[in-house]
Interface confidence: low
């Protein structure tokens, strides 16, 4: 499809002149930030951003790539180098330490410097690094964590936990030796390391004693509580604050978010990760956009401001499965949450960052016609005279041989939410990729997000913008609309 | 390898504090640009940038990803949307029209709006769009084109040509009907459309009559001249200017670039594309860095300034062959040219942009250890119990089945310059990819390069920065060090 208006050079010249005008008008907001929001698209490399843009554009009945995402409207962009201290291609644990604590760590460790060693409990103590969320709380701000994964997952855990093993969700996931040496599981750290005002996501089963039936799936033993210490961590957390409320479904979340007596809110909507957006039951589970809105409602009551971490955590899971449909629909939902947050906050006092922890070996190639489905086939056939998709993976479970040859694919197969795009190398799980990811920034001090930076720089921009440790002497005018 | 200094949080905190300090000091250069340089890495998507960074770092005996490329030092970054009017994933012709002329066009067409149709000569007239280089020449600046491909190739042709078919290198590549309708081959347009002061790259055979022996390969008929009109375009070009000089090897280039009587310089160093850097004979052919230096020497004599296009054009070719070794060594050489240009120019009066026309379905995955070779194997085995490489392609000639199965690979095989990384789908040629590419900017008005933009914006930033059409009323102070 060739849009007739785009045939005219004036279309492009006018559009560019407008973009230039906007660029010339762009003025850095030189005050401090009252609020900090970081949107983390787990696994959302640049190829995922572009493919999600096309999908979202086509959902709006446009051709696709011309239609900006919410994140595309952010005025400043930088590239972030994601390697961990020990690996060229990192995981979500080491990267969370970087962008949330400002220090790079080792693969599979969280909230610890690289002096800590994976799985070695005795290398924990003394190597903890403190997250910007923790520093924001110490400065009197309200803080929140929202994710579509379990709240004890690597990315959100970077905001509150210190562990040599990202898989220690509950004590049942830990070896006895580590427990005996005094290491704490992540669920325990969630409720005891610091005071978090809003906690929304999945992860119920790690909070309750082994065998405790799940409220949503009482007859499914695999969803039971997992804790071996017999504790009820939700109960313990509720006991800490008079205004604390625990919810486990969408209706309760909506009620709680509108209730002025609720000061602390924990919502755990699934035993493990939340469902993919395409499988979500909207009567039972909130969307990421709804969780974001609920969190902002509560947090924005604090006159000192807030820190909010919001993760589209299952973009990554879709890619690991070699299922681009899942990854991209998650990415579109993630962008919807960014859009909503933009409507509910002001760029005059809120620094909003959007970034990824790492990328995936996911590519969008061939030479598909403009307006064709992002999940569609490439024009023409491959050398083996079979069709192939525009979307492909470098490695992963999409690799299949049928009778010693690459399987053919039809347009209807390739458009299925279950379809796994083909890969060059067969792996149980498609891997992350090591290329730089984008950081999009808007609000006070967003102009500091520039050029090519280490991923750890992201945490420092947030800390500096809000005059948190170690930048309390930031020398910035107070945020818009505040009186000191 | 875990570098001991990186185990200390101070290492990262200090580094980030320095980066913040630099970001805070960053002041837009608000004057006009005297000179414009655009460095175009053909096919240099973000995954290629990161992999090249690791390769260059390791060549310098560092671990790799921590070591900045020359382009990494540029203060401003934007993302560029590369789709063409008719395709989600573009080619180098449509994209050249965008970043050099400021208007998006159709696949395989050059210097024409999207009202033109591929291969239809009669849709050319009236649809021409004018390049920034052409506008710079009209404003009295000197202009140059430097590339490692043939100078009539799609990317450089975007600076001077208008053609419905990028493959019309010489009249021998055109159908008779197109010639009869008055369409001109690209080599003819190179010498007749506009006055270009410096032309350096490959492409000798398109300039001489069919059967004319090549000076470097006189006994190889496949390298003979190709022109059917019997013309000697080099002779015609030399006749246009008293100070014009033609060279075809490195020694002659060096002499000419130091000769003050030379005002116009054409250097064509191969019959077709120049050799890959790893195959180059340094006694016969100049490197991209040397060509860039020679061009800058000549162009910078003009007190009104210059426009220079420099292309690392064979990054793209290495990827098309599924040979990452070639693509990445070309990318490192491209970065060396950027570094040299930075030493020879001042950011006070020169706007330098570095970008790509499009990406490739090239990924850098698995979880390789820090410091391991970029061409090395992934840790562990694939599901088929065979080794696999960290670098892989989505599609391309790297797809091979051996006895109905994926072939194994060793570390020594994967490190060979000839090795083709595996791909998910077998194609003669690996394809481009459609995700956004980075634009790096330094110098006057570089701060306008921000956020997510259409690729056509790139040309407008250059035109505006130098107060060229349509921005002659740019309202910018004159460039540093000039008197009006």
């Amino acid at each position: 499809i060739i849009p007739v208006e785009e045939e005219n050079p004036d279309f492009w010249n006018r559009q560019a002149a407008e973009a230039l005008g906007a660029a010339k008008k762009l003025q850095p907001i030189q005050t401090a930030a009252k609020n900090l929001i970081i949107f983390l698209g787990d696994g959302m490399g640049v190829s995922t951003v572009t493919a999600a843009r096309i999908l979202k554009g086509q959902k709006e009945e446009k051709l696709g790539p011309e239609t900006p995402l919410a994140m595309d409207h952010f005025p400043y962009v930088a590239l972030s180098k994601t390697y961990s201290v020990d690996k060229h291609v990192p995981d979500s644990a080491a990267t969370a330490t970087a962008y949330l604590c400002g220090v790079k760590g080792n693969f599979q460790t969280i909230g610890l410097s690289a002096a800590a060693r994976y799985n070695q409990c005795n290398t924990t103590r003394g190597n903890e690094v403190v997250s910007v969320m923790n520093r924001a709380k110490k400065a009197g701000k309200s803080v929140g964590v929202v994710t579509t994964t379990r709240v004890q997952h690597a990315s959100p855990a970077g905001a509150y936990a210190h562990t040599v093993n990202r898989n220690w969700y509950s004590d049942a996931n830990m070896p006895g030796s580590a427990r005996r040496e005094g290491c704490k599981d992540i669920a325990t750290q969630l409720i005891s390391n610091m005071d978090i005002d809003v906690i929304l996501g999945g992860g119920r089963k790690y909070m309750f004693r082994m065998g405790a039936p799940d409220p949503e799936y009482p007859h499914d033993y695999s969803q039971d509580g997992t804790r071996m210490d017999g504790k009820n961590l939700v109960q313990e957390w509720l006991a800490k604050h008079q205004g604390a409320r625990y919810v486990w479904n969408r209706t309760e979340l909506m009620q709680a978010s509108l209730d002025p007596s609720v000061t602390h809110l924990m919502g755990l909507f699934e035993p493990g990760d939340m469902k993919y957006e395409i499988h979500r039951d909207p009567t039972l589970d909130p969307s990421l956009m709804e969780m974001t809105e609920a969190a902002l409602r509560l947090l924005s009551r604090n006159p000192r401001g807030f820190f909010l971490f919001v993760e589209g955590g299952r973009i990554d899971h879709g890619h690991h499965e070699s299922r681009a449909y899942r990854a991209l629909t998650e990415a579109v939902m993630f962008d919807d949450a960014i859009e909503r947050a933009g409507q509910l906050t002001s760029e005059e006092d809120t620094l909003t960052l959007v970034t990824a922890d790492h990328s995936h070996v996911f590519s969008f190639g061939a030479y598909p016609l403009r307006g064709s489905s992002i999940f569609g086939l490439a024009p023409g056939k491959a050398q083996d005279r079979k069709a192939y998709t525009a979307l492909l993976y470098g490695n992963g479970p999409g690799y299949v041989l049928k009778d010693g040859a690459r399987p053919d694919v039809t347009e209807s197969e390739s458009g299925s939410p279950e379809y796994r795009q083909q890969a060059a190398v067969p792996l149980d799980e498609e891997t992350h990729a090591g290329e730089d990811v984008a950081v999009f920034a808007r609000g006070p001090q967003a102009h500091l997000v520039h050029g090519v930076q280490e991923q750890s720089f992201v945490a420092h921009v947030m800390a500096f913008a809000a005059c948190l440790e170690p930048y309390t002497a930031c020398d910035l005018a107070p945020p818009a609309g505040t009186t000191d | 390898i875990i570098p001991v200094e990186e185990e200390n949080p101070d290492f990262w905190n200090r580094q980030a504090a320095e980066a913040l300090g630099a970001a805070k000091k960053l002041q837009p250069i608000q004057t006009a640009a005297k000179n414009l340089i655009i460095f175009l890495g053909d096919g240099m998507g973000v995954s290629t940038v990161t992999a090249a960074r690791i390769l260059k770092g390791q060549k310098e005996e560092k671990l790799g990803p921590e070591t900045p490329l020359a382009m990494d030092h540029f203060p401003y970054v934007a993302l560029s949307k590369t789709y063409s009017v008719d395709k989600h994933v573009p080619d180098s012709a449509a994209t050249a029209t965008a970043y050099l002329c400021g208007v998006k066009g159709n696949f395989q067409t050059i210097g024409l709006s999207a009202a033109a149709r591929y291969n239809q000569c009669n849709t050319t007239r009236g649809n021409e769009v004018v390049s920034v280089m052409n506008r710079a020449k009209k404003a009295g600046k000197s202009v140059g084109v430097v590339t490692t491909t043939r100078v009539q190739h799609a990317s450089p042709a975007g600076a001077y040509a208008h053609t419905v078919n990028r493959n019309w290198y010489s009249d021998a590549n055109m159908p008779g009907s197109a010639r009869r309708e008055g369409c001109k081959d690209i080599a003819t347009q190179l010498i007749s459309n506009m006055d270009i002061d410096v032309i350096l790259g490959g492409g000798r055979k398109y300039m001489f009559r069919m059967g004319a022996p090549d000076p470097e390969y006189p006994h190889d008929y496949s390298q003979d001249g190709t022109r059917m009109d019997g013309k000697n375009l080099v002779q015609e070009w030399l006749a246009k200017h008293q100070g014009a000089r033609y060279v075809w090897n490195r020694t002659e280039l060096m002499q000419a670039s130091l000769d003050p009587s030379v005002t116009h310089l054409m250097g064509l160093f191969e019959p077709g594309d120049m050799k890959y850097e790893i195959h180059r004979d340094p006694t016969l052919d100049p490197s991209l860095m040397e060509m860039t230096e020679a061009a800058l020497r000549l162009l910078s004599r003009n007190p009104r300034g210059f426009f220079l296009f420099v292309e690392g054009g064979r990054i793209d070719h290495g990827h098309h062959e599924s040979r990452a070794y070639r693509a990445l060594t070309e990318a490192v050489m491209f970065d060396d040219a950027i570094e040299r240009a930075g030493q020879l120019t001042s950011e006070e009066d020169t706007l330098t942009l570095v970008t790509a026309d499009h990406s490739h379905v090239f990924s850098f995955g698995a979880y390789p250890l820090r410091g391991s070779s970029i061409f090395g194997l992934a840790p562990g085995k694939a599901q088929d119990r065979k080794a696999y490489t960290a670098l892989l392609y989505g599609n391309g000639p790297g797809y091979v089945l051996k006895d109905g199965a994926r072939p194994d690979v060793t570390e020594s095989e994967s490190g060979s310059p000839e090795y083709r990384q595996q791909a998910a789908v077998p194609l003669d040629e690996e394809t481009h990819a459609g995700e956004d590419v980075a634009v790096f900017a330094r110098g006057p008005q570089a701060h306008l390069v921000h956020g997510v933009q259409e690729q056509s914006f790139v040309a407008h930033v250059m035109a505006f920065a130098a107060c060229l059409e349509p921005y002659t009323a740019c309202d910018l102070a004159p460039p540093a060090g000039t008197t009006d």
Epitope: A172, N173, Y221, S222, H320, E429 | -
Partner: nanobody
Framework: QVQLVESGGGLVQAGGSLRLSCAVS????????IGWFRQAPGKEREFVAR????????RYDDSVKGRFTVSIEDAKNTAYLQMSSLKTEDTAVYYC???????????????WGQGTQVTVSS
């Protein structure tokens, strides 16, 4: 639904041996990783050993290393825990569990058996 049934527990003298079996029904064992856990009276459940279905990774808790061996017999859809040089502190209810490992989720055991008692007397 996947079901796991342990057997082979009993009373044994210190220094003796036992072989526990874990029969899996409802799904091919090759889809899962198998873990063995134990819980002594008044204590937390603790990890003993695990093996991935393809045999590529086996791990033992330090307290049983060199004495216990975990194995899988695909044909019978059964996993085994061979225990030798037993000590009184090995007395516990032993559970087998089936689950999957993924980098995104970590080690997770989705299905558990009801347990079999092992008592080691001095």
């Amino acid at each position: 639904q996947v079901q796991l049934v342990e057997s082979g527990g009993g009373l044994v003298q210190a220094g003796g041996s036992l072989r526990l079996s874990c029969a899996v029904s409802g799904r091919a064992l090759s889809d899962y990783n198998i873990g063995w856990f134990r819980q002594a009276p008044g204590k937390e459940r603790e990890f003993v050993a695990r093996k991935t279905w393809d045999g590529s990774s086996t791990r033992y808790d330090d307290s049983v290393k060199g004495r216990f061996t975990v194995s899988i017999e695909d044909a019978k859809n059964t996993a085994y825990l061979q225990m030798s040089s037993l000590k009184t502190e090995d007395t516990a209810v032993y559970y087998c569990a089936a689950g999957r490992y993924s980098r995104a989720r970590g080690w997770e055991y989705d299905y558990w058996g009801q347990g079999t008692q092992v008592t080691v007397s001095s």
